[in-house]
C-alpha cells in the first residue's frame, strides 16, 4: 500500500500565491496528484513528477481560503491524501483619495485604509502638464491625511499615493486637482538709497508669483530708465545705475503663469554725488612719494592723479589707478623739487571735484669722505661715508695714473662703507673713483689718490736640487738667501698644464717632500721667499717622476 506524502505545509503566503512544501513518502510511486479548491467550489488538479517536494499555487485570489490535497500515485493505486488548508494574504485596501485646496499654494490629501500595520504611505505630487516636476513624500503608516505646501499658484497637479504593508507596495491611487488663485501684493519700500543706487523691498505671499516686474521712471522726464524681471522667490532687489540727486517713480507688479497683479508704486530721491576728501602725502623720499586719500566706499571706476613740478607746469604726468585704491606710490620724481599733486575720482561717468596738495621731494642721497689707509706695496684700504638705507651697490674704479695698467672695477654691497684693494704693483700712483647706485640713481663720482709702497729688495732662494725621486714623490732642496725670511712657498705643476699645487714651509727649512705626484710626468717647480707682505723673485727648476 502507498503511504501518504509527509509533512505537507504552506511555507509562504502572498496575495495571489501559496508555496507548498512536503517530504517524499517511503513506498515507490510514479507521480503526485495535487488538487486544490477554488473559491467557486471547483477543484483544480495538477500532476507533478515524483521527485517534486515543493510547488507554488499561482493566480489565486487575495484573502481567500484554499484546501489542498496531495496524493502519491502508482499505476491505478493512490495513497491517502495529505491535506492542508491556507489563506492567501488580504490586499490592504487603500481607497477614497481626496484632494482639497490648502490655500492657494498647497494641497490637503485625505485617504482611507484598513487599520493594518501600514509601514508608510508614499505620495507623489507632480504638475499635470510637466512630469519632470515630481515631488515625493514618505509619511508614517498611521497617517490618513497629509498637507503638501510650497506648490505653484493656480496650477493643475496629479497626486498619487500607495501604502507599504508587510514590506510590499499596495496599488497606486491617483487624483487630479488645482491650487487656488493668487493673493495680492503687500507693500513696497525703499532702503539704502545712495547717489546712484537703491534697494527695493516688498512683501508678498510665498510661492504666489512666478516673477516680479519692476519699472523705474525718472520723475521729471517721465522716461522709463529701467525695466527688469526678477524671480518670484525674491523680496528685495538692488537697482543700480541711477543718477545722483534725481527723483524716481518705481512700480512693482507680481506675475503668475497667466496674469499680473495691480501695480504698487513708490517715489524716491537719490543722494548727491559723493566727494573725495582727506588728501595727504606720506613717505616723501628724494625720488618719489606716496599719495593717500579718503572717500565713501563707493564703486569708483578709477582715480586720475596729476603730478607737476611747481615751477614747470609743462612737466606734468598723469596716472589712472583702479577705483578700489585709496593710496598710490608716485616714483621717478626729481630730488629736492617742489611738486603740486592733484586727484579726482570717476564714478558712473561723473568726475568728482579735484583735490590738490603741494609737496617737495627730499634731497638726493650723497656719498663723501673717501679715504685711503693701510697702504702696502700691493694693497690699500678704502673708507667712505654715505646716506644709509638708500644704496644697492657702490662701484669702485681704480686707474694707475700712468694709464699703463688695465682699469680695475669693484662692485661692493650698498651696506658696506670700507673696501680692501689688493693685487696691486708696488711703487705705483693710483686714482680711486667711487659712486653709489640706487634703483633710480647713480650719484656723482668722488675720487682720491693712493700710492703703493716700494718693495724692499729681498734675496731669492738659490740652487734648486731634486733628489729621492719616485713614481709619485720627490724631495726638493734649496739654499736660503742671506737675509732672514719668514717662509718659503713652493709651487709645482705638470709642465703640460693643470692645477698648481702649493706648499708653504718655515723660513728655517731648506727642503721639503713633494707628494701625490703623477708617474712619468715632468713637473715645473718655483720657490719664493716671503716676509710680511714682501715676496722675493722666484727660483725655478724641473724634474720628471
Amino acid at each position: 500500500e502507498l503511504d501518504t506524502p509527509k509533512d505537507l505545509q504552506v511555507s509562504e503566503t502572498a496575495e495571489t500565491s501559496l508555496t507548498l512544501l512536503w517530504k517524499t513518502p517511503l513506498a515507490k510511486f510514479d507521480r503526485y496528484r495535487l488538487n486544490y479548491s477554488l473559491p467557486t467550489g471547483q477543484w483544480v488538479g495538477v500532476q507533478l513528477p515524483r521527485n517534486t517536494t515543493s510547488y507554488v499555487l499561482r493566480g489565486l485570489e487575495p484573502g481567500q481560503e484554499y484546501n489542498v490535497l496531495l496524493t502519491a500515485e502508482k499505476g491505478r493505486h493512490k495513497s491517502k491524501p495529505a491535506r492542508v488548508k491556507a489563506s492567501t494574504e488580504e490586499v490592504p485596501s487603500l481607497e477614497n483619495l481626496t484632494v482639497t485646496e490648502a490655500g492657494w499654494d498647497g494641497l490637503r490629501l485625505n485617504w482611507t485604509a484598513d487599520d493594518l500595520a501600514y509601514e508608510y504611505f508614499v505620495i507623489q505630487v507632480q504638475e499635470a502638464n510637466n512630469v519632470e516636476t515630481a515631488h515625493n513624500f514618505t509619511v508614517p503608516g498611521n497617517l490618513r491625511a497629509a498637507d503638501i505646501p510650497g506648490l505653484k499658484v493656480a496650477t493643475s497637479y496629479r497626486v498619487s499615493i500607495y501604502g507599504v504593508a508587510r514590506g510590499y507596495r499596495t496599488p497606486v491611487l491617483s487624483a487630479e486637482t488645482s491650487t487656488g488663485t493668487t493673493p495680492n501684493l503687500g507693500e513696497v519700500t525703499v532702503a539704502e538709497v545712495g547717489w546712484d543706487a537703491l534697494t527695493l523691498n516688498w512683501t508678498a505671499p510665498e510661492g504666489a508669483y512666478k516673477n516680479f516686474f519692476i519699472q523705474v521712471l525718472e520723475a521729471d522726464t517721465t522716461q522709463t530708465v529701467q525695466n527688469l524681471t526678477v524671480p518670484g522667490g525674491l523680496r528685495s532687489v538692488d537697482l543700480p545705475g541711477l543718477k545722483a540727486a534725481t527723483r524716481y517713480y518705481i512700480t512693482l507688479r507680481g506675475v503668475t503663469q497667466d496674469f499680473g497683479t495691480a501695480p504698487l508704486s513708490v517715489e524716491v530721491l537719490t543722494e548727491d554725488l559723493p566727494q573725495l576728501g582727506g588728501l595727504s602725502v606720506t613717505e616723501v623720499s628724494w625720488d618719489g612719494l606716496t599719495l593717500n586719500w579718503t572717500t565713501d566706499d563707493l564703486a569708483y571706476k578709477h582715480f586720475v592723479v596729476q603730478v607737476q613740478e611747481a615751477n614747470n607746469v609743462e612737466a606734468a604726468q598723469n596716472l589712472t589707478v583702479p577705483g578700489s585704491l585709496r593710496a598710490v606710490d608716485i616714483p621717478g620724481l626729481k630730488a629736492d623739487t617742489p611738486y603740486r599733486v592733484s586727484i579726482y575720482g570717476v564714478i558712473q561717468g561723473y568726475r568728482t571735484p579735484m583735490l590738490s596738495t603741494d609737496v617737495s621731494t627730499a634731497r638726493e642721497p650723497e656719498i663723501g669722505n673717501l679715504n685711503v689707509s693701510d697702504v702696502t706695496p700691493k694693497s690699500f684700504n678704502l673708507s667712505w661715508t654715505a646716506t644709509d638705507g638708500i644704496f644697492d651697490m657702490f662701484t669702485i674704479e681704480i686707474i694707475d695714473s700712468n694709464r699703463l695698467l688695465q682699469t680695475a672695477e669693484h662692485n661692493i654691497s650698498g651696506a658696506e662703507r670700507t673696501a680692501h684693494i689688493s693685487g696691486l704693483p708696488p711703487s705705483t700712483d693710483f686714482i680711486v673713483y667711487l659712486s653709489g647706485i640706487a634703483p633710480s640713481i647713480r650719484t656723482k663720482t668722488i675720487s682720491t689718490t693712493a700710492t703703493t709702497e716700494a718693495l724692499t729688495a729681498m734675496g731669492s732662494p738659490k740652487e734648486v736640487i731634486f733628489s729621492d725621486i719616485t713614481e709619485n714623490s720627490a724631495t726638493v732642496s734649496w739654499r736660503a738667501p742671506t737675509a732672514q725670511v719668514e717662509s718659503f712657498r713652493i709651487t709645482y705643476v705638470p709642465i703640460t698644464g693643470g692645477t698648481p699645487s702649493m706648499v708653504t714651509v718655515d723660513g728655517t727649512k731648506t727642503q721639503t717632500r713633494l707628494v701625490k705626484l703623477i708617474p712619468g710626468v715632468e713637473y715645473l717647480v718655483s720657490i719664493i721667499a716671503m716676509k710680511g707682505f714682501e715676496e722675493s723673485e722666484p727660483v725655478s727648476g724641473s724634474f720628471t717622476t
Partner: antibody, heavy 118, light 108 residues
Framework: QVQLVQSGAEVKKPGSSVKVSCKAS????????ISWVRQAPGQGLEWMGG????????NYAQKFQGRVTITADKSTSTAYMELSSLRSEDTAVYYC???????????WGQGTTVTVSS | DIQMTQSPSTLSASVGDRVTITCRAS??????LAWYQQKPGKAPKLLIY???SLESGVPSRFSGSGSGTEFTLTISSLQPDDFATYYC??????????FGQGTKVEIK
C-alpha cells in the same frame, strides 16, 4: 539634480567587516529611499536592501539578512552599508542608488570596489 | 523573496532589429517592474519604471509592457548604442527588490 558620491575602494580580510558610505546632494535626502545593489565580477545585479532616511528603518533581501546593516545620517545626507563576516564571494562593486516613486532606481553612485582576500 | 526570471540570457541582433526581452515574476507584482541598461564598467541606467513608463531622457524606441507576472522590454529598432546588458527588477518589495539575471544583447 541628485548626485550620489560613494567612498573609495576597500581591500578586506575574510571574516572582517566593511562600511561603505554614500553622500547625496541635490533634492531632499530624507524623503527618498536609498537602495544598495552589488555586482560581483562578471555577474548580475543583486539588491541587498534599502532605507528611507526620514524614518531610519531599513529593509533587507533575505540573502543578506543578519549580515548587512544599512543606516542613514540625515544631518550629513549620507547613507551607509556595512557588511560583516566577509568572504571571498563578497568581492564586488557595491552601488548606492536613489529610488523614484515607483521604486525604479533613477540615480546611482559611481560604485565602490570591495575586494575580500587573505 | 519574489524571484525574477529573464529570457533569453544572451541575444544576438543587428542594428535596426526589433528586440524583445521577457521577464517573469514568481508571483504577481502588479505593474511594479523596472528595466535597466548596463554597459561594462558603468552603473546601471533606469529605462522603464511602473512596467511601461519611460524614464525622462530615454529614447522612445524603448518600451515596456505587461502586468502581474509576465513583462517585456522592446527595442523597436536596435541602435549601435543599445548593445549592453538589460536587467528587470521587481519593485513590489519596498523600497526596491530583486533583479532578473540579465540579458546580454550582442552584435550578430
Amino acid at each position: 539634480q541628485v548626485q550620489l558620491v560613494q567612498s573609495g575602494a576597500e581591500v578586506k580580510k575574510p571574516g572582517s567587516s566593511v562600511k561603505v558610505s554614500c553622500k547625496a546632494s541635490g533634492g531632499t535626502f530624507s524623503s527618498y529611499a536609498i537602495s544598495w545593489v552589488r555586482q560581483a565580477p562578471g555577474q548580475g545585479l543583486e539588491w541587498m536592501g534599502g532605507i528611507i532616511p526620514i524614518f531610519g528603518t531599513a529593509n533587507y533581501a533575505q540573502k543578506f539578512q543578519g549580515r548587512v546593516t544599512i543606516t542613514a545620517d540625515k544631518s550629513t545626507s549620507t547613507a551607509y552599508m556595512e557588511l560583516s563576516s566577509l568572504r571571498s564571494e563578497d568581492t564586488a562593486v557595491y552601488y548606492c542608488a536613489k529610488g523614484n516613486f515607483y521604486g525604479g532606481l533613477d540615480y546611482w553612485g559611481q560604485g565602490t570596489t570591495v575586494t575580500v582576500s587573505s | 523573496d519574489i524571484q525574477m526570471t529573464q529570457s533569453p540570457s544572451t541575444l544576438s541582433a543587428s542594428v535596426g532589429d526589433r528586440v524583445t526581452i521577457t521577464c517573469r515574476a514568481s508571483q504577481s507584482i502588479s505593474s511594479w517592474l523596472a528595466w535597466y541598461q548596463q554597459k561594462p564598467g558603468k552603473a546601471p541606467k533606469l529605462l522603464i519604471y511602473d512596467a511601461s513608463s519611460l524614464e525622462s531622457g530615454v529614447p522612445s524606441r524603448f518600451s515596456g509592457s505587461g502586468s502581474g507576472t509576465e513583462f517585456t522590454l522592446t527595442i523597436s529598432s536596435l541602435q549601435p548604442d543599445d548593445f549592453a546588458t538589460y536587467y528587470c527588477q521587481q519593485n513590489k518589495k519596498f523600497p526596491s527588490g530583486t533583479f532578473g539575471q540579465g540579458t546580454k544583447v550582442e552584435i550578430k
